[in-house]
Each structure stands twice: as structure tokens, then as C-alpha cells.
């Protein structure tokens, strides 16, 4: 297993609709054809997997149908979007990149993007 540098923004504020996007960029030492991207959430010392996708270079990222993540790739950059976020989902979102094929296997883990989420103000009830 060889180490690889992964860069991501330090902090992002999610939109009022609970959507946060950020770029995860990795310094690919070779010509990888198969890449796996995993988003981990660290909160209160607990680390949980948010979503993961494996993709072939030049193709779209495919997350599971029920995933809260979507993404696109361009060269050594992955543009990740996490949706359906609420205030309780505020935390450090860490990008993990694995170059699966061809060998050698490379692993890189970013420092994390702190995502802040604000629950929207409830709309006042209106009578019609």
C-alpha cells in the first residue's frame, strides 16, 4: 500500500436546502484506470461511512441508488455533492481515495471538510 496526497477544502457551509458540494483532488502517481472514492464522516470521535463509489477513469461515478451522494470526475478531481443534510449532520467529512487498478495500490485520505448545516426556518402557517 502506497500513500497518496488528497486535498479538499477545510470548510463549507451547506445551502439552505441541505446540499453541500466540494472537490476532492488526489495526486495520482500513475495512470490509474479504476478509482474508489469513499466519504467518511467524523463526529464526536466516531467515524462512519457516508457513501462510496468505484469508477473507471473517464466514466461517471456511480453511487448506490439510495445514496445521499452524487459526483462527477474530471482527471484527478472528484466533485462530490451530499444532499439531504440537516443541522445534526454537521461534522468533518473526509475524502478517501483508493487507486484500485492497475497495481500498485495507492491510498490517500484528506484532512476533511468541515460541513456546517443550518436547518431552514420553518415557514409560518398560512390560512387560505
Amino acid at each position: 500500500c502506497k500513500a497518496m496526497h488528497v486535498a479538499q477544502p477545510a470548510v463549507v457551509l451547506a445551502s439552505s436546502r441541505g446540499i453541500a458540494s466540494f472537490v476532492c483532488e488526489y495526486a495520482s502517481p500513475g495512470k490509474a484506470t479504476e478509482v474508489r472514492v469513499t466519504v467518511l464522516r467524523q463526529a464526536d470521535s466516531q467515524v462512519t461511512e457516508v457513501c462510496a463509489a468505484t469508477y473507471m477513469m473517464g466514466n461517471e461515478l456511480t453511487f448506490l441508488d439510495d445514496s445521499i451522494c452524487t459526483g462527477t470526475s474530471s482527471g484527478n478531481q472528484v466533485n462530490l455533492t451530499i444532499q439531504g443534510l440537516r443541522a445534526m449532520d454537521t461534522g468533518l467529512y473526509i475524502c478517501k481515495v483508493e487507486l484500485m487498478y492497475p497495481p500498485p495500490y495507492y491510498l490517500g485520505i484528506g484532512n476533511g471538510t468541515q460541513i456546517y448545516v443550518i436547518d431552514p426556518e420553518p415557514c409560518p402557517d398560512s390560512d387560505f
Partner: antibody
Framework: QVQLVQSGAEVKKPGASVKVSCKAS????????INWVRQAPGQGLEWMGW????????NYAQKFQGRVTMTTDTSTSTAYMELRNLRSDDTAVYYC?????????WGQGTLVTVSS | EIVMTQSPATLSLSPGERATLSCRAS???????LSWYQQKPGQAPRLLIY???TRATGIPARFSGSGSGTDFTLTISSLQPEDFAVYYC?????????FGPGTKVDIK
Amino acid sequence: QVQLVQSGAEVKKPGASVKVSCKASGYTFTNYGINWVRQAPGQGLEWMGWISAYNGNTNYAQKFQGRVTMTTDTSTSTAYMELRNLRSDDTAVYYCARLGHYIDYWGQGTLVTVSS
Amino acid sequence: EIVMTQSPATLSLSPGERATLSCRASQSVSSSYLSWYQQKPGQAPRLLIYGASTRATGIPARFSGSGSGTDFTLTISSLQPEDFAVYYCQQDYNLPFTFGPGTKVDIK
């Protein structure tokens, strides 16, 4: 090295607006947020809100909602804070401060005096 | 909103003495999101401690932070003349971010 350089002192009349700038250097501006914090004479630190330079999204303290606007110009790595309808109790030193995983670097502060 | 309280409001000590400053949050704060700042008259605040216990770059070892949940402490093991200042704790665990009212450490 990381630096946040703020605009100079301002004297304003009640009801006017003020726009304070904060020019960042020494780091990738869009990877961080900018907080605005003020300090009235002899008082403590009061958080006003912050802007995510990555996407321009903002979050303001309830007290300032509707009266403050925070913006960034990523081409010049500069953040702005505009406060409208100034009152005498808005007299304070206004600080910008960088937010990553925590607030680390601060500007030197801008004194805004509101007086008739 | 998480309300931060600090005690005592003023601490009068002599150089060489140990200073213990307390910060309490109205609800639990993950220690990763608790910072301490020092402010001297006419100057901007300076980051001392982040993540409740990690010293910022260039901060002397006499400054240490501890605590978890709702109770946090800043300790200055042996006060130096340049340490007499106001100290603030701050949380960025939840929006809105909030500061404590400060503890003034002055010369006895």
C-alpha cells in the same frame, strides 16, 4: 504566511451603512471561511456571522439578520461585511477571522464609530 | 444557541503563579470544536488552544487545555508578565458560534 488585512477606521452617522473589507493572503482563499466578530469598547467578543468562501453561502447571527451582508470576491481574495442602518451601539472594532476546522487567524480590526 | 460562561470574571495573580480558567457550555460540545484565545489591549485575539487541548503554532508549553462535554479548562502553569490579558473560550460545534464573556488575568 497567512495574513488578513482590514480596511481603515470609519466614522458614520446613525442610519448610514458601513462596508469593511478583509484582504486575505498566504493561503488558498476558497478553501476557508471568513467570520466577522465585533467588540464594543470595553466589552467581549460578539460573533456576527460567517461566509463560506468556497461557495458564497452565509450564516448570520439572529441579532444581525436583515441588517448585515457578507460577501467575497474570490478574484482578489477579499471578504466584505456591510452593516446597514447603523446605531450608536454599533460603535465597535470589527474583526475578520479565518475559519478552517477552527478559527485561527484574525485581521487587525477596523474601528467603526457611529456618532451624530 | 450554545451559551458559554467563564469563571472567574477576573483572576488576580502574581508572575510565576499557576492560573486556572474555567469555561462551561450550556450543552455538550465535542472537544474538537472548543478553542481558547488571548487578547491584549488594542490587539486582535490570538489563538492559543484548539480542539480543547492542542496548542496552536508558537504557543508556549506553559499553556494547556483540557476538558470535555460541557466543562473545559485553560491552565497557565507559571504566569509570565506577557500573559496578563483577557482569555476567551469559543465553540464552533453548532451554529451560531459563540464566545464566552472572557476572564481577565491581572497582576496582583
